[in-house]
Interface confidence: low
């Protein structure tokens, strides 16, 4: 017992002797923040000059303040021992480490690329300003069905599966919001399959008319090659989106 | 949607480049592109970031620069390159744009 | 390095409660940049807030963020059976390396 304090006495003495000798020998670690070491003062604590920062004690050098110009906006000042932090001007958004970069917003239902702002392709949406414009889900993974249809800035709403809308079916979830006394779960479901469906064929044929006068046989071939793509994005390419038919880019877009 | 590939069973010491391809998008438009990894029952751990579409540095942990290489590799790819391999490095790799995209994740052991 | 200290694991609550997790970081975390992950065994994590109180797209508005400089935290209210799940902050940083760190990661048990 008596030695292990003793070893513990001991240690704490080297430590603290340590301490004092690499003092002794460094007189630059004595330096607090927001000075550096001056070498040519004889290792004398200067303050760092204006426009430079340090934030660590013992430097022999302050670092260069970082300067908000342009689409940087000052967020918080340089100080003697914390660099200048940056943000955005409205309509720009941080990129980075540090707000490295500034990026331009987007509208909802667009991402930015090279060229600019452009919109989501078809069967896919961004809800933000910025980032990437992402597929919609795909409800059948799920064994669901389509509720509501997606759009550039929304994606899907995924409703119960087909076979939940069949009559006597035992569990139907509709993610509708509240129900209204008095009314099963099966004749909502049922209503909003009825309704849906018809929408979707009104949809469709009005589409492949406006695709018959306005763009002739080579689009009217893919609408009945691909039955099941929701034809009413199909006008798209009129608004400026960057978007392609399969046949003629893998992955439906041009970024 | 993004989809990493590369994992496999390699020895100490060997290299390996995993690769990030996104689908649906294209990083030819500025994404951060980071790198996390978890080894088997362990939390994650960053790797490393990198700016697509653009010539901005990219950003390290401090224990991964020079053994690990984050670089875009086409429109649609980012990789990791990773050399001197140890034990130490045996985990699921994902792939993830700006935190809020990841791919499920690609498995790489190191073990001889 | 940075250092993010999260609440211990495991952390339990009933159906229909509440979990609150800690996440304290070694340094002041750049501009808010905090993010807090949800993962389940075998799948990629999932962001569920980032800029420490901002809402990801699609999750539920039982997650709330909030906090600022070096302590932040994730509240779970209404808990529901498929929140069982480990959550971990993710911080960032005005630095060109270790930009990034992650919590260790904090289990939430729901019974």
């Known amino acids: 017992m008596g030695n292990s304090c003793y070893n513990i006495v001991a240690t704490l003495l080297l430590v603290l002797n340590f301490e004092r000798t690499r003092s002794l020998q460094d007189p630059c670690s004595n330096c607090p923040a927001g000075t550096f070491c001056d070498n040519n003062r004889n290792q004398i604590c200067s303050p760092c000059p204006p426009n430079s920062f340090s934030s660590a004690g013992g430097q022999r050098t302050c670092d260069i303040c970082r300067q908000c110009k342009g689409v940087f906006r000052t967020r918080k000042e340089c100080s003697s021992t914390s660099n200048a932090e940056c943000d955005c001007t409205p309509g720009f958004h941080c990129l980075g480490a540090g707000c490295s970069m500034c990026e331009q917003d987007c509208k909802q239902g667009q991402e930015l690329t090279k060229k600019g702002c452009k919109d989501c392709c078809f069967g896919t949406f961004n809800d933000q300003k910025r980032g990437i414009c992402r597929p919609w889900t795909n409800c059948s993974l799920d064994g669901k069905s389509v509720l509501v249809n997606g759009t550039k800035e929304r994606d899907v709403v995924c409703g119960p599966s087909p076979a939940d809308l069949s009559p006597g079916a035992s569990s139907v979830t509709p993610p509708a919001p509240a129900r209204e006394p008095g009314h099963s779960p099966q004749i909502i479901s049922f209503f909003l399959a009825l309704t849906s469906t018809a929408l979707l064929f009104l949809l469709f044929f009005l589409t492949l008319r406006f695709s018959v006068v306005k763009r002739g046989r080579k689009k009217l071939l893919y609408i009945f090659k691909q039955p099941f793509m929701r034809p009413v994005q199909t006008t798209q390419e009129e608004d400026g989106c960057s978007c392609r038919f399969p046949e003629e880019e893998e992955g439906g877009c041009e970024l | 949607s993004l989809e990493e590939s590369g994992g496999d069973l390699v020895k100490p010491g060997a290299s390996l480049t995993l690769t990030c391809t996104a689908s649906?998008?294209?990083?030819?438009?500025?994404?951060?592109m980071c790198w996390v990894r978890q080894a088997p029952g362990e939390g994650l751990e960053w790797i490393a970031c990198i700016y697509t579409g653009s010539s901005g540095t990219p950003h390290y942990a401090s224990w991964a620069k020079g053994r690990f290489t984050i670089s875009q590799t086409s429109s649609t790819t980012v990789t990791l390159q990773m050399t001197s391999l140890t034990a130490a490095d045996t985990a699921t790799y994902f792939c993830s744009s700006e935190g809020n995209l990841w791919g499920p994740g690609t498995l790489v052991t190191v073990s001889s | 390095a940075q250092v993010l200290t999260q609440t211990a694991s495991p952390v339990s609550a009933a159906v229909g409660g509440t979990v609150t997790i800690n996440c304290q970081s070694s340094q002041s975390v750049y501009s808010n940049w905090l993010s807090w992950y949800q993962q389940k065994p075998g799948q990629p994590p999932k962001r569920l807030i980032y800029?420490?109180?901002t809402l990801a797209s699609g999750v539920p508005s039982r997650f709330k963020g909030s906090g600022s400089g070096t302590q932040f935290t994730l509240t779970i209210s209404d808990l529901e059976c498929d929140d069982a799940a480990t959550y971990y902050c993710?911080?960032?940083?005005?630095?060109?390396?270790?930009?990034?760190?992650f919590g260790r990661g904090t289990e939430v048990e729901v019974k």
């Open positions: 649906g998008f294209s990083f030819s438009s500025r994404h951060y």
């Open positions: 800029s420490a109180s």
């Open positions: 993710a911080g960032g940083y005005n630095t060109v390396t270790d930009t990034f760190a």
